[in-house]
Interface confidence: medium
Amino acid sequence: YDFTNCDFEKIKAAYLSTISKDLITYMSGTKSTEFNNTVSCSNRPHCLTEIQSLTFNPTAGCASLAKEMFAMKTKAALAIWCPGYSETQINATQAMKKRRKRKVTTNKCLEQVSQLQGLWRRFNRPLLKQQ
């Protein structure tokens, strides 16, 4: 999916008002320096691509993020403010419904959410030069 035509300011507002708090809650009890940010993005569409991938694609050691509240809010924001996004997600949604994995917080998931926090911060500061 091409995130170029999303309403970035509305997505940013959703992040600042609520998604950010959910990410902090998920990471509670974890030191902010515990994980190094290894995933980066260069502009807002690229950041949303990376955010979508890390949030919804199961990875080795962390298959359960899609059921978290921050993930569902992210999905809702993308569906609402990115034209045509929903249509691209229907097959993925059906597959996820079939899997229905139970939520398990692993160290790998914590690391992944730490990466997400970095990507969201980058999304909110699109004019900063890439490190």
């Epitope: 609520t18 809010k73 809702a76 949604t93």
Partner: nanobody, 112 residues
Framework: EVQLVESGGGLVQPGGSLRLSCAAS????????MGWFRQAPGKEREWVAT???????FYADSVKGRFTISADNSKNTAYLQMNSLKPEDTAVYYC??????WGQGTLVTVSS
């Protein structure tokens, strides 16, 4: 199997109010995200409002300040309180969950 049933639609005069309900079975409201959408005759379905399980809400600019979305987790029901209704609010109103399970819709007609 998720089932969503909307109710509360009807005919109302401009400036009037209606409260729509969306009763859900097969899902847990407190851990999901619910939305209201509408489709006017001859137009595409458009998003109206969203509420998450923790109570956070989002609104389309066209209804902000007039419509209020809420949920009663104990009843697994979402609500859309619509005030200061305008003729352009006339549409079939649908609720949907995050996995895009849809209700059958309820018709709201704003006319004098």
């Amino acid at each position: 199997e998720v089932q969503l049933v909307e109710s509360g639609g009807g005919l109302v005069q401009p400036g009037g109010s209606l409260r729509l309900s969306c009763a859900a079975s097969g899902l847990t409201f407190s851990t999901t995200v619910m939305g209201w959408f509408r489709q006017a005759p001859g137009k595409e379905r458009e998003w109206v409002a969203t509420i998450a399980g923790d109570g956070s809400t989002f609104y389309a600019d066209s209804v902000k300040g007039r419509f209020t979305i809420s949920a009663d987790n104990s009843k697994n029901t979402a609500y859309l309180q619509m005030n200061s209704l305008k003729p352009e609010d006339t549409a079939v109103y649908y609720c949907a969950d995050i996995n895009e399970d849809w209700g059958q819709g309820t018709l709201v007609t704003v006319s004098s």
